[in-house]
């Protein structure tokens, strides 16, 4: 029977910069029941606070609701693991909410085959940013990535769309049914999950671009 091993806060994520959650990995439990607590203070403060919500994020997590989340202040936090034999602390972690945003997937994915008379046909893909992300403030730059593949294929074809919310693809196999998905990330954040797949049937007379 030993004191607990050192825990590690390994992940923090915010869906929209208004709330965030951090998760820790317990160290060894020393063969005894172990309690974990996360304490934090914000830059410029000395007063320590305990995690406001250990429930919302699931096991070994701390969730900071709206009233506890500030984009203007860096959070300094650590986890304390305690059992009957003693305690151990994680390293201090510094968190700036701006840099942990993982948005929801883009919305309203629309896919259409365009066959202009005077040009090669193409697949036109359009989507909207996730609703929780406020792009009007200017500091949030969302980048997009598209993936598509024929329904029965194993490999995805990936295209980086940059900041645009529509994209053209010229090279497609005629007569195939394609799956199309899109995801997004802030410049200094994390990729969202892929959006639900949209299916599109490519006409047999679609002329493939060389």
């Amino acid at each position: 029977q030993l004191p607990p091993g050192k825990p590690e806060i390994f992940k923090c994520r915010s869906p929209n910069k208004e709330t965030f959650t951090c998760w820790w990995r317990p160290g060894t439990d020393g063969g005894l029941p172990t309690n974990y607590s996360l304490t934090y203070h914000r830059e410029g403060e000395t007063l320590m606070h305990e995690c406001p919500d250990y429930i919302t994020g699931g096991p070994n997590s701390c969730h900071f609701g709206k009233q506890y989340t500030s984009m203007w202040r860096t959070y300094i936090m650590m986890v304390n693991a305690t059992n009957q034999m003693g305690s151990s602390f994680s390293d201090e972690l510094y968190v700036d909410v701006t840099y942990i945003v993982q948005p929801d997937p883009p919305l309203e994915l629309a896919v259409e085959v365009k066959q202009p008379e005077d040009r090669k046909p193409y697949l036109w893909i359009k989507w909207s940013p996730p609703t929780l992300i406020d792009l009007k403030t200017g500091w949030f730059t969302l980048l997009y990535e598209i993936r598509l593949k024929p329904e029965k294929a194993a490999e995805w074809e990936i295209h980086f769309a940059g900041q645009q919310t529509e994209f053209k693809i010229l090279s497609l196999h005629p007569g195939q049914k394609y799956l199309v998905q899109v995801r997004c990330k802030p410049d200094h954040g994390y990729w969202s999950a892929w959006s639900p797949a949209t299916f599109i049937q490519i006409p047999s007379d679609f002329t493939m671009n060389d």
Partner: antibody, heavy 118, light 112 residues
């Protein structure tokens, strides 16, 4: 304890390439961005770029875009900085640095001296 | 790119006396999220740089309280209230508001 251990000094010919490694330990490698900074002899610090080890997403200083390539090997918790088309002005100590969930970095490697000389 | 200009280039200080280093940026360092990402590093002789101050005025973990940072917009200052022998080295300001991140040219602090 968080550690960033860099590869040893290199002497290279002009026009060649160099690949510097930065092995991370003491934390979950994929959690935090790795930055690369260089320091020419007796000079200030110059930021080369950064990489997110979780998905290999990179941001480069335009000055080095096309010549510097940042990569990671998640299986060995190692970050790499490759610089091609070397010239004498690239002679410098190259540092890797690690951020928190922030855009500034608090942990640095010990540095790797790259000398470019014919 | 944002140019960071530090003054003075070097500083010779008597132990126990104060020291002040100035850093000026060529454009505002206020990020569109409202934060100012101006930091100070110290590079001791033969060592890698170490973080002293982040976001203008916040001491990093373990940094003695004789170090303080201040400023806003484009003008920033690092102060050492009472210089000690272990404070010798080159001090760099750095901004991470704009990509590419940039550093000042450095201020060499020596003990008289």
């Amino acid at each position: 304890e968080v550690q960033l251990v860099q590869s040893g000094a290199e002497v290279k010919k002009p026009g060649s390439s160099v690949k510097v490694s930065c092995k991370a330990s003491g934390y979950t490698f994929t959690s935090y961005w790795i930055h690369w900074v260089r320091q020419a002899p007796g000079q200030g610090l110059e930021w080369i770029g950064e990489i997110d080890p979780s998905d290999s997403y990179t941001n480069y200083n335009q000055k080095f875009k096309g010549r510097a390539t940042l990569t990671v090997d998640k299986s060995s918790s190692t970050a790499y900085m490759e610089l091609s088309s070397l010239r004498s002005e690239d002679t410098a100590v190259y540092y890797c640095g690690r951020s928190f969930f922030t855009n500034w970095f608090a942990y640095w490697g010990q540095g790797t001296l790259v000398t470019v000389s014919s | 790119d944002v140019v960071m200009t530090q003054t003075p280039l070097s500083l010779s200080v008597t132990p126990g006396q104060p020291a002040s280093i100035s850093c000026r940026s060529s454009q505002s360092l206020v990020h569109s999220n409202g934060n100012t990402y101006l930091h100070w590093y110290l590079q001791k002789p033969g060592q890698s740089p170490q973080l002293l101050i982040y976001k203008v005025s916040n001491r990093f973990s373990g940094v003695p309280d004789r170090f303080s940072g201040s400023g806003s917009g484009t003008d920033f200052t690092l102060k050492i209230s009472r210089v000690e022998a272990e404070d010798v080295g080159v001090y760099f300001c750095s901004q991470s508001t704009h990509v590419p991140f940039t550093f000042g040219g450095g201020t060499k602090v020596e003990i008289k």
